[in-house]
Interface confidence: low
Amino acid sequence: SVSEIQLMHNLGKHLNSMERVEWLRKKLQDVHNFVALGAPLAPRDAGSQRPRKKEDNVLVESHEKSLGEADKADVNVLTKAKSQ
């Protein structure tokens, strides 16, 4: 089913189709950054890969911004998302 992904799209319903996809990427980025799925970030060695954005394979940057309360709430929704 597409229910989980549709839920996330609905949360960003004020955006157009393209921006919804980018919005989802941002939310996934937040999940990755703040370990909301309960998994550790990839180790910070030279070969580590950390999907900060899906296509980004650089190490964790020192200037990561903290989430606002609203974003944290959205991330909580994302933690429930699983592949169909």
Epitope: M18, V21, E22, Q49, P51, K54
Partner: antibody, heavy 117, light 112 residues
Framework: EVQLVESGGGLVKPGGSLRLSCAAS????????MSWVRQAPGKGLDWVGR??????????DYAAPVKGRFTISRDDSKNTLYLQMNSLKTEDTAVYYC????????WGQGTLVTVSS | DIVMTQSPLSLPVTPGEPASISCRSS???????????LDWFLQKPGQSPQLLIY???YRASGVPDRFSGRGSGTDFTLKISRVEAEDVGVYYC?????????FGQGTKVEIK
Amino acid sequence: EVQLVESGGGLVKPGGSLRLSCAASGFTFSNAWMSWVRQAPGKGLDWVGRIKSKTDGGTTDYAAPVKGRFTISRDDSKNTLYLQMNSLKTEDTAVYYCTTGATFDSWGQGTLVTVSS
Amino acid sequence: DIVMTQSPLSLPVTPGEPASISCRSSQSLLHSNGYKFLDWFLQKPGQSPQLLIYLGSYRASGVPDRFSGRGSGTDFTLKISRVEAEDVGVYYCMQALQTPWTFGQGTKVEIK
């Protein structure tokens, strides 16, 4: 509606240069991470490189065969992506596509680059 | 670099019947966060590629629900539950776990 329109392709001799452009509309270009993907005639898809949004550093990453020869840049005020190709080789002959987003959500129609003497 | 291998390279199909394409990666695309960094694209004859599936199993906007993606860390499958004539073209898988992003060699789907 998302629209990507590539231009600048053509015939160029080996060792020559060419600059491709990709005009974007229908989404917030300045927020988007953009990529170039190419396809040699009758062949499969090959990733060329990517540029991040300026807010994410604006940095670039390239495939090994083009690193040092190709440069990706962007002009957010013009909603345009560029691919500067120098020291072109015959094996660079391909249709070049610009794509949006983390998973290449949208593609342009492509522009053909032919490198031949 | 991560090598992506697709099979079969050619797939004759019958409209209304199911079809399946396999994609294998030389290393796991499953990150510790649970996401699989594998995408599927379709390039119809004479057209630009279009995104079908991203992150292993999520359908892109506007993609019919007859398309589905699944897989483990290294073995992935794109399934078409009931092939339609408009589904012909070349299907590509692509890994986006690490740069350089790499594509499979493509699977050409054609009507029998």
